[in-house]
């Protein structure tokens, strides 16, 4: 198992719109029709004011109006819920579809896309029903913006909730070579398909993606637990032939100074098809982006049952070294390196100030409140409540696979 890596099944808490843990001051909008439809009235299941946030301008055709929620700290947002306008049960305004944008630092904004690059999310069919959208992939964000859409000039209004958990890993971004394609009976695409940073000259930097989404790959890398995805979806992989150095180098940036105990790398070892665990790992540490790498690198040779073809988490001890940046080299021991997840076990060093775009003033990581009850959905057919961290007897959502 991946110690220290978050469990997506336990990252489905209501983040505080409905129960007001998120204060009014953290909810804003591009515009509002009136004070009674201001951003603060956008809480799910709330009937405050005129029963929702409604923008002043038309959302057709420009789609520039937005509702913004500031979570104050980085969170993994796994689901969102939307509703139309309450208005004492007389509201008729809702949004049939919307887009999401998110930011970790308030400066760079990314558009959320599903696994196939689709940005538009199906919304509500009526003003009262709650429609829940399971975000696959989830987004690591401090700020989230909802952009309602319409196919003609019409009024749209919105109430929302976000679901997820605090991003306690502290990982802000990783830099890695672009994943490659393996050719078997079909092409196996080992690229990081959800990476939200930049890609220049075969290098991805400044973002997060599949190596930090909580989803570990299966023993057979051609298979995935995601519906209708391409072969290799869960893994990011590199061919030994492309790296004359004999290793793949990655860099990891964290929110603040941390003492690193270990790195967990979930690797494929289906050696019959060329995938091998790394032969060894070497990591270097530094406290700032312009600083020198400190001390000797930590080196770790991998032993164990390399003949066992099952995928597994490899633990790399990091000896409590203090840093905000890590650079790790993963040595090839076969034709391919395939990783599905990388996580870190670390402790924040006391009194270290957060990096720009990192963590923010203290906020509780525990779930702020109970989930709302009863909702209807286009995408999901619910049975009971909206999701919370999975426990025996907690609700299950039926899914439509078409």
């Amino acid at each position: 198992d991946m110690k220290g890596h978050f469990d997506p099944a336990k990252c489905r808490y209501a983040l505080g719109m409905q129960d007001r843990t998120i204060p009014d001051s953290d909810i804003s909008a591009s515009s509002s029709w009136s004070d009674s439809t201001a951003a603060r009235h956008s809480r799910l299941e709330s009937s405050d004011g005129d029963g929702a946030w409604c923008p002043a301008g038309s959302v057709f055709p420009k789609e520039e109006e937005y509702l913004q929620v500031d979570l104050q700290r980085l969170h993994l947002v796994a689901l969102v819920g939307t509703q139309g306008r309450h208005a004492g049960g007389l509201g008729k305004e809702f949004s049939r579809s919307y887009r999401l944008r998110y930011s970790r630092d308030g400066r760079r904004w990314m558009g959320w896309k599903d696994r196939w690059g689709q940005e538009v999310i199906s919304g509500n069919e009526d003003p009262e029903g709650v429609v829940l959208k399971d975000l696959g992939p989830p987004m690591v964000a401090r700020l989230v913006r909802f952009y309602p859409r319409a196919d003609r000039v019409m009024s749209v209004c919105l109430r929302v909730e976000l679901y997820g958990c605090l991003w306690r890993d502290g990982l802000l971004s990783y830099t890695a070579p672009v994943g490659q394609t393996m050719y078997l009976s079909e092409a196996v695409y080992l690229n990081d398909s959800t990476y939200d940073g930049h890609t220049v000259g075969g290098l991805q930097y400044g973002g997060l993606g599949q190596l930090a989404d909580g989803v570990v790959g299966l023993d057979d890398f051609r298979k995935s637990q995601e519906l209708r995805v391409w072969p290799g979806y869960d893994y990011v992989g590199w061919s030994n032939h492309s790296f004359s150095s004999g290793y793949v180098e990655m860099e990891f940036e964290f929110d603040r100074l941390r003492a690193f105990q270990a790195m967990q790398v979930h690797c494929n070892n289906m050696h019959t098809l060329g995938a091998r665990l790394p032969g060894g790992v070497e990591c270097r540490f530094r406290r700032g982006p312009a600083m020198a790498w400190e001390g000797e690198p930590m080196r770790h040779n991998l032993g164990g049952n390399l003949g066992d073809p099952r995928a597994r988490a490899v633990s790399v001890p990091l000896g409590g070294r203090v840093a905000r940046f890590l650079q790790c080299r993963f040595l090839f021991a076969g034709p391919w390196l395939l990783f599905s997840e990388i996580s870190f076990i670390s402790d924040v060093v006391n009194n270290s100030s957060p990096a720009l775009g990192g963590t923010f003033p203290p906020a509780p990581w525990w779930p702020p409140g109970p989930p709302p009850t009863n909702f209807s959905s286009l995408e999901l057919e619910p049975r009971g409540q909206q999701p919370v961290a999975k426990a025996e007897g907690s609700p299950t959502i039926e899914f439509r696979m078409d």
Epitope: S224, L227, R228, M401, D402
Partner: antibody, heavy 119, light 111 residues
Framework: EVQLVESGGGLVQPGGSLKFSCAAS????????MSWVRQTPDKRLELVAI????????YYPDSVKGRFTISRDNAKNTLYLQMSSLKSEDTAIYYC????????????WGQGTSVTVSS | DIVLTQSPASLAVSLGQRATISCRAS??????????MHWYQQKVGQPPKLLIF???NIESGIPARFSGSGSRTDFTLTINSVEADDVATYYC?????????FGGGTKLEIK
Amino acid sequence: EVQLVESGGGLVQPGGSLKFSCAASGFTFSSYGMSWVRQTPDKRLELVAIINSHGFSTYYPDSVKGRFTISRDNAKNTLYLQMSSLKSEDTAIYYCARGGYGNYGMDYWGQGTSVTVSS
Amino acid sequence: DIVLTQSPASLAVSLGQRATISCRASESVDSYGNSFMHWYQQKVGQPPKLLIFRASNIESGIPARFSGSGSRTDFTLTINSVEADDVATYYCQQSNEAPYTFGGGTKLEIK
């Protein structure tokens, strides 16, 4: 070695209920979607329930929706199928299978447990 | 629902000869460049066993004499040089659109 062992079949009257369980071993149960598939006496195969790896998402065809409930306990590596309001057409061998929710079909199957619905 | 029609319903092949089984879908089972069609083998008294997934990928541990091909609505399972151990019923299954459906099966016998 991957193993799936079903238990809980038997003879039941129309309108009755039955609960199966499937004990999984030899793989990381919590990483895989799981399914129940039945094979009718005429040898036709029908997928009757799917659950994703975390247990949050389920799927049922119309033929069993509202009567069957799939669930899982990842701590116990066990899959369940609760069947109620049983009909004679539910008579079949019920197999627990790994996969179904995914992009590759079902790659391991249990030996199956037999259900006969008859008065 | 997507209906899968297998042909022939039964097939008798001499040892060492090639067996070809067809599966036709009532609508395309392709999405995003992949064919979500899978093939299973079921021997008498045993559960089904995955042979081929996504039209052409051979499952780990399956002999190389089994192969799959096809796209959209027409798919083929081929057994090169049939052996006595291949006597079984073969099923196709699609997982592109719910409800996921199986073909009616093709029974392979030795001539």
